[in-house]
């Protein structure tokens, strides 16, 4: 069951309720363990884990990435500006995930898990997030469109793609989860 | 117990490309969320660290070696190598493979405690 | 030039205590609670002695403890034995994704 569901809490009334940042925090451990899953079953299937980053730099995908000016590193450290990075950035990967969707033949179920525990992620920080005006959700039209040039590249591309959106969703998350430990 | 062992030529010529393979036993470096580093040592100097494999096989590099490293891994042969281009007599050093990834390192991407270490192999760049 | 500042040698005396310090950035000691500390006897591999700024690793004597304020960590041995003699090395995650180490600090151990 993701952690973003209530049935493990049920299941063990005697256990103290998860904090917010508890519940926040175990939602990105629980997605990161899904990435992982879902690597295992794209290194397998192409030579994509072995691509250096010079060849995933060619790549002309706009995802998500920490910045200084973001607010989430140590040094210049705001915590209202970290969490809007983080609520946009996931925003943002929310149409990458999409892609996934069809991509995983063995880890389907694995996709739409990391998929749907994305979105309570983000409700979980939405919840946190004082400054609700700041954040900027992505244009449906925009991303139906990107969708659909994802969905249209050679297997080659598409291959790369899923590995990039991937690892860079991995490290989003893990930037993510050491700023907000820090908050 | 997890073993590692540094393997590769002793002696390299300036220019070439340095060349070593750390074998682990006791242990699969594909099933744990473990990474796997690598530091060196020159002469009679302090430790520098150089680069990590995690778990997911993404690599991580020391900014001042960056255009001169590469990590990779060979998750069959349960070994993970190092190759260090362009090399100057600078770059003699003992160099370690270990462990690195305690606790929540994988969550968080923090491969700062490295607690099984390889003996070292003594590397020597010179004509 | 290490990225994290160490006294190149300290000395002290069997039985007492002797703190060796670790100065960083807020980039790297300040930036979590990502720190180790290793011990180099002479002539062999470096060993893990604490992690996560504080926790000892398997098997390390409680007389070997850690702390950290702000930019600055500090490893404490207590009760000094002449084996303890060794270059000890302070470690840190660096943001982004990579990792330093201290220049490493010899102890000296007087009888």
């Known amino acids: 069951v993701p952690p973003g569901e209530d049935s493990k809490d049920v299941a063990a009334p005697h256990r103290q309720p998860l904090t917010s940042s508890e519940r926040i925090d175990k939602q990105i451990r629980y997605i990161l363990d899904g990435i992982s899953a879902l690597r295992k079953e794209t290194c397998n299937k192409s030579n994509m884990c072995e691509s250096s980053k010079e060849a995933l730099a060619e790549n002309n995908l706009n995802l998500p990435k920490m910045a200084e000016k973001d607010g989430c590193f140590q040094s210049g450290f705001n915590e209202e500006t970290c969490l809007v990075k983080i609520i946009t950035g996931l925003l943002e990967f929310e149409v990458y995930l999409e892609y996934l969707q069809n991509r995983f033949e063995s880890s389907e179920e694995q996709a739409r898990a990391v998929q749907m525990s994305t979105k309570v992620l983000i409700q979980f920080l939405q919840k946190k997030a004082k400054n609700l005006d700041a954040i900027t959700t992505p244009d449906p039209t925009t991303n139906a469109s990107l969708l659909t040039k994802l969905q249209a590249q050679n297997q080659w591309l598409q291959d790369m793609t899923t590995h990039l959106i991937l690892r860079s969703f991995k490290e989003f998350l893990q930037s993510s989860l050491r700023a907000l430990r820090q908050m | 117990e997890v073993q590692l062992q540094e393997s590769g030529p002793g002696l390299v010529k300036p220019s070439q490309t340095l060349s070593l393979t750390c074998t682990v036993s006791?242990?699969?470096?594909?099933?744990?969320?473990?990474?796997w580093s690598w530091i060196r040592q020159p002469p009679g100097k302090g430790l520098e660290w150089m680069g990590v494999?995690?778990?997911?096989?993404?690599?991580y590099y020391k900014p001042s070696l960056k255009s001169r490293t590469s990590i990779s891994r060979d998750t069959s042969k349960n070994q993970f190598s190092l190759q260090l281009s362009s090399v100057t007599p600078e770059d003699t050093a003992v160099y370690y493979c270990?462990?690195?990834?305690?606790?929540?390192?994988?969550?968080?991407?923090?491969?700062?405690?490295?607690?099984?270490w390889g003996k070292g192999t003594l590397v020597t760049v010179s004509s | 030039q290490s990225a994290l500042t160490q006294p190149p040698s300290m000395s002290g005396t069997l039985g007492k205590t002797l703190t060796i310090s670790c100065n960083g950035t807020s980039s790297d000691i300040g930036s979590g609670d990502y720190v180790s500390w290793y011990q180099q006897l002479p002539g062999t591999t470096p060993k893990l002695l604490i992690e996560g700024v504080t926790t000892r690793a398997s098997g390390i004597p409680d007389r070997f403890s850690a702390s950290k304020s702000d930019n600055t960590a500090s490893l404490t041995i207590s009760g000094l034995q002449s084996e303890d003699e060794a270059t000890y090395y302070c470690?840190?995650?660096?943001?982004?994704?990579?990792?330093?180490f201290g220049g490493g600090t010899h102890l000296t151990v007087l009888s």
């Open positions: 006791g242990g699969s470096i594909a099933t744990s969320y473990y990474a």
């Open positions: 494999i995690d778990y997911d096989g993404d690599t």
């Open positions: 270990a462990r690195a990834g305690l606790g929540d390192s994988y969550y968080l991407g923090t491969y700062y405690a490295m607690d099984y």
């Open positions: 470690a840190s995650y660096r943001e982004t994704n990579n990792v330093v």
